[in-house]
């Protein structure tokens, strides 16, 4: 019998290479059974994950999965960093793996770097 625990399917060690000024949707795939849990996004600051308040979020439903979406309209250089979603389920908190956004500020980039180039520049997270 399939588990009815809430599961958050953000891939472990996942990355997104995105550009300042572009719109972007960060998806948190959520599996649940009867009642959709309350889901929130937070941004990692060292070992603390700071809850994102007042941001545009939405739900998208697909056949076996729901997606809790954090909207970036548009992406800002300060959006660089790692994000995690978490669900409140039966008074317990379930946390996802973190996913990292590598933001390139197009004003300071003569051309858009490749996705792998971004992966080799983790210092961007702290700039």
């Amino acid at each position: 019998k399939e588990s009815c625990d809430v599961q958050l399917y953000i891939k472990r060690q996942s990355y997104h290479s995105i550009f300042a000024g572009d719109p972007f949707k960060l998806e948190c795939p959520v599996k649940y059974c009867a009642h959709r849990p309350q889901v929130t996004w937070c941004k990692l600051n060292g070992t603390t994950c700071v809850k994102l308040e007042g941001r545009h979020t939405s739900w998208k439903q697909e056949k076996n999965l729901s997606f809790f979406i954090l909207h970036f309209e548009p992406v800002l250089p300060s959006d660089n960093g790692s994000y995690r979603c978490s669900a409140n389920f039966l008074s317990a908190i379930i946390e996802s793996h973190s996913t990292t956004l590598y933001v390139t500020d197009v004003k300071s980039a003569s051309e858009r770097p490749s996705k792998d180039e971004m992966a080799s520049r983790p210092w961007l997270l702290y700039s």
Partner: antibody, heavy 120, light 112 residues
């Protein structure tokens, strides 16, 4: 049933480019990571790199990074490997493998491997 | 890079004997999520590697329970409690915690 199948030329000339494809069935590649691993004759396994087919983001072994490109095509449910400026040292069996998702994240399914010989 | 060092390089045992293969990593494999992504693979001649053990000690489905894994941090062990003829293979440890992913050099198991 999860299956991965590598294909491509078995012989590549020195200084040429090795090109392989990994055709995947029984799962949707965008939900996983696809890795490439190689094994020179009589030697051990070497990780080449991986791709997240959901967004094309790659991670490579630094020892090969300047020569390797991994890509994917979600519509065909396949991944590809290109290795440029090959030498005899690149002669190996090349495998693609799937990294399963939550909660284990390990290489749970492998192709049979394809032998590539670099020779003129 | 994380260096994975296996010992011994080869092992010749009689049927029914206990096999112990060690794997030492140059850094801790404990990930930020609290899990340790250390895996063991078995490779028989002419075949691709087959996953035996994941997350240090979890046995893959269909793998006989004579196989077991243990360890933490940087030191890990694969044990075969009673070696059978079909266990003749090369065994590799693999770490999935850090980039680049790395394998041990392999341990060849033979029957005396």
């Amino acid at each position: 049933q999860v299956q991965l199948q590598e294909s491509g030329p078995g012989l590549v000339k020195p200084s040429g480019t090795l090109s392989l494809t990994c055709a995947d069935s029984g799962f949707n590649i965008k939900d996983t990571y696809i890795h490439w691993v190689r094994q020179p004759p009589g030697k051990g396994l070497e990780w080449i790199g991986r791709i997240d087919p959901a967004n094309g983001f790659t991670r490579y072994n630094p020892s090969l990074k300047s020569r390797v490109t991994i890509s994917s095509d979600k519509s065909k449910n396949q991944a590809s490997l290109k290795l440029s400026s090959v030498t005899a040292a690149d002669t190996a069996v090349y495998y693609c493998a799937r990294e399963d998702g939550y909660p284990y994240y390990t290489l749970d399914a492998w192709g049979q491997g394809t032998t590539v010989t670099v020779s003129s | 890079d994380i260096v994975m060092t296996q010992s011994p390089d080869s092992l010749a045992l009689s049927l029914g004997e206990r096999a112990t293969i060690n794997c030492k990593s140059s850094q801790s494999l404990l990930d930020v999520d609290g899990k340790t992504y250390l895996n063991w693979f078995q490779q028989k001649p002419g075949q691709p590697p087959k996953r035996l053990i994941y997350l240090v000690s979890k046995l893959d489905s269909g793998v006989p329970d004579r196989f077991s894994g243990s360890g933490s941090g940087t030191d890990f062990t694969l044990t075969i409690s009673s070696v059978q003829a079909e266990d003749v293979a090369v065994y590799y440890c693999w770490q999935g915690t850090h980039f680049p992913r790395t394998f041990g050099q392999g341990t060849k198991l033979e029957i005396k």
